[in-house]
Interface confidence: low
């Protein structure tokens, strides 16, 4: 018996061929011997089956001795053995219809789980294998779960259903809702304007929700809410904003915040959360601010950084075009009785300068100048 696999909602064509290459009488029946369709001369006739409005044939092929049964908008319950009667012969075709659906919305938050459910006819024992856009293979039976979705899981999932050495492929488009970056770090000299950006890694026609930026300053004992906002159809409106610092927020996506001045008391890390309408859970992005200050007090030239720096970062003080006078894996360095000239304070990671502040040291009878 020939086996044909079909997909729910698709169209399938079951073939039936006579030895005579001409139009002769044929009938298609189901396993209950109920007529589905057949011919009377050059006319298509239909029986009382449930397929009535979805069954068809190709009259253009009858003259060649081909009498296909076409079933449109396939349903799982269309799975059956179909019998073609032609020339006193019976051709049997077993049709198995499968459906594969995401049992939740196909727009999922990063970290959430995706469950794909296979609808299959009774008595079948299919296996399912899905391949994610990043090439991960996931194998399962009637249900297939992927926990902790990542940004790279966005895109087309290709799922293969295997049954009786036959296979049918499904494609499901999944959108993982997330920020483009899980974390970012901004390095600024004291007094500079700070720009924080939170680009989303997906596009949807309408985006509605609410968000908040909580900030943990390095010098503070507890975190505080810096700003809360609403998002309506991609338009941003601020609800509450702290008075210190005086944050400003852009009115359009991507979410964009401006801190007028980088000051040591603001150095630290924040967590922006975004709750989207009709979604459980929130999107998160961490943002870090490192602030540098170079000062000269009497005979002491000091360079300090505040904020979340990694232990491998190097802080150096050097006279322009000279070797570093002092270089340490610490958050403050200083030089006593510095020579006159332009001094550079450098924060670097494996030789790459992340932040630089210059301070001019004048001869001892003058006061220092900070450019």
């Amino acid at each position: 018996k020939k086996v044909v696999l079909g997909k729910k909602g698709d169209t399938v064509e079951l073939t039936c061929t006579a030895s005579q290459k001409k139009s002769i009488q044929f009938h298609w029946k189901n396993s209950n011997q109920i007529k589905i369709l057949g011919n009377q001369g050059s006319f298509l006739t239909k029986g009382p089956s449930k397929l009535n409005d979805r069954a068809d044939s190709r009259r253009s092929l009858w003259d060649q001795g081909n009498f296909p049964l076409i079933i449109k908008n396939l349903k799982i319950e269309d799975s059956d053995t179909y019998i073609c009667e032609v020339e006193d012969q019976k051709e049997e075709v077993q049709l198995l219809v499968f459906g594969l659906t995401a049992n939740s919305d196909t727009h999922l938050l990063q970290g959430q789980s995706l469950t794909l459910t296979l609808e299959s006819p009774p008595g079948s024992s299919p296996s399912v294998q899905c391949r994610s856009p990043r090439g991960k293979n996931i194998q399962g039976g009637k249900t297939l779960s992927v926990s902790q979705l990542e940004l790279q899981d966005s895109g087309t999932w290709t799922c293969t259903v295997l049954q009786n050495q036959k296979k049918v492929e499904f494609k499901i488009d999944i959108v993982v809702l997330a920020f483009q970056k899980a974390s970012s770090i901004v390095y600024k000299k004291e007094g500079e304007q700070v720009e924080f950006s939170f680009p989303l890694a997906f596009t949807v026609e309408k985006l509605t929700g609410s968000g908040e930026l909580w900030w943990q300053a390095e010098r503070a004992s507890s975190s505080k809410s810096w700003i809360t906002f609403d998002l309506k159809n991609k338009e941003v409106s601020v609800k509450r904003v702290t008075q210190d610092p005086k944050l400003q927020m852009g009115k359009k996506l991507p979410l964009h915040l401006t801190l007028p001045q980088a000051l040591p008391q603001y150095a630290g890390s924040g967590n922006l959360t975004l709750a989207l309408e009709a979604k459980t859970g929130k999107l998160h992005q961490e943002v870090n601010l490192v602030v540098m200050r170079a000062t000269q007090l009497q005979k002491n030239l000091t360079c300090e950084v505040w904020g979340p720096t990694s232990p491998k970062l190097m802080l150096s003080l050097k006279l322009e075009n000279k070797e570093a006078k002092v270089s340490k894996r610490e958050k403050a360095v200083w030089v006593l009785n510095p020579e006159a000239g332009m001094w550079q304070c450098l924060l670097s990671d494996s030789g790459q300068v992340l932040l630089e502040s210059n301070i001019k040291v004048l001869p001892t009878w003058s006061t220092p100048v900070q450019p």
């Epitope: 990043r134 090439g135 194998q139 087309t156 295997l162």
Partner: antibody
């Protein structure tokens, strides 16, 4: 009998292009994913690219992304690999393979291979 | 990328010997109790030939003296009694993740 026959290889200068073809027979071509695997002279095997049964999805190894394009013509039972901006390190025997799937994907039939030499 | 390391890189054996080749993956190649590991045989100037798929399944037409075992990160190809036609290079290959990767190969020579 499954047969995969590659053609289109040869000597090409760095930076130039070449198009490999693979004529398939002995099986229903449109039911199978296909892939290209290469082997540099005296070296091991290296997967290059894969295309799904209907051509809608393609995968590439990082070193060829943006330079190579895998495609297929199911009406002609033919697989292609368009190779642009060729480099000396692309010199290899290129095998056309059929990609079968049980629980994993694997290469169950291979062509005889075609040599691509990139040299000035 | 998942790295596959085969050992030994080469070995000499005689007809009738039992031979074992191992393949170690840098991370697990298992999904839902399926081990996505294959073994191929390649003779000089010829295309590779599939021997074993999914760690232990024998490919069509492959003699039963070939067998595969292992799970997770450690896999083995065993030839129970070497035949003259078995002298070749053997490769393991994972298909858990893109890019598909192969081991560096094990050359089996006549002693």
């Amino acid at each position: 009998e499954v047969q995969l026959v590659e053609s289109g290889g040869g000597l090409v200068q760095p930076g130039r292009s070449l198009r490999l073809s693979c004529a398939a027979s002995g099986f229903t071509f449109s039911n199978y994913g296909m892939a290209w695997v290469r082997q540099a002279p005296g070296k091991g095997l290296e997967w290059v690219a894969t295309i799904s049964y209907d051509g809608s999805i393609t995968y590439y190894r990082d070193s060829v992304k943006g330079r190579f394009t895998i495609s297929r013509d199911n009406s002609k039972n033919t697989l292609y690999l368009q190779m642009n901006s060729l480099r000396a390190e692309d010199t290899a025997v290129y095998y056309c393979t059929r990609e079968e799937q049980y629980s994993s994907w694997y290469f169950d039939f291979w062509g005889q291979g075609i040599l691509v030499t990139v040299s000035s | 990328d998942i790295q596959l390391t085969q050992s030994p890189s080469s070995l000499s054996a005689s007809v009738g010997d039992r031979v074992t080749i191992t393949c170690r993956a840098s991370q697990s190649v298992s999904i839902s109790s399926h081990d996505l590991m294959q073994w191929y045989q390649q003779k000089p100037g010829k295309a590779p030939k599939l021997l074993i798929y999914d760690a232990f399944n024998l490919a069509s037409g492959v003699p039963s003296r070939f067998s595969g075992s292992g799970s997770g990160t450690d896999f083995t190809l065993t030839i129970s009694s070497l035949q003259p036609e078995d002298f070749a290079t053997y490769y393991c290959q994972q298909s858990k993740d893109d890019p598909y990767t192969f081991g560096q190969g094990t050359k089996l020579e006549i002693k």
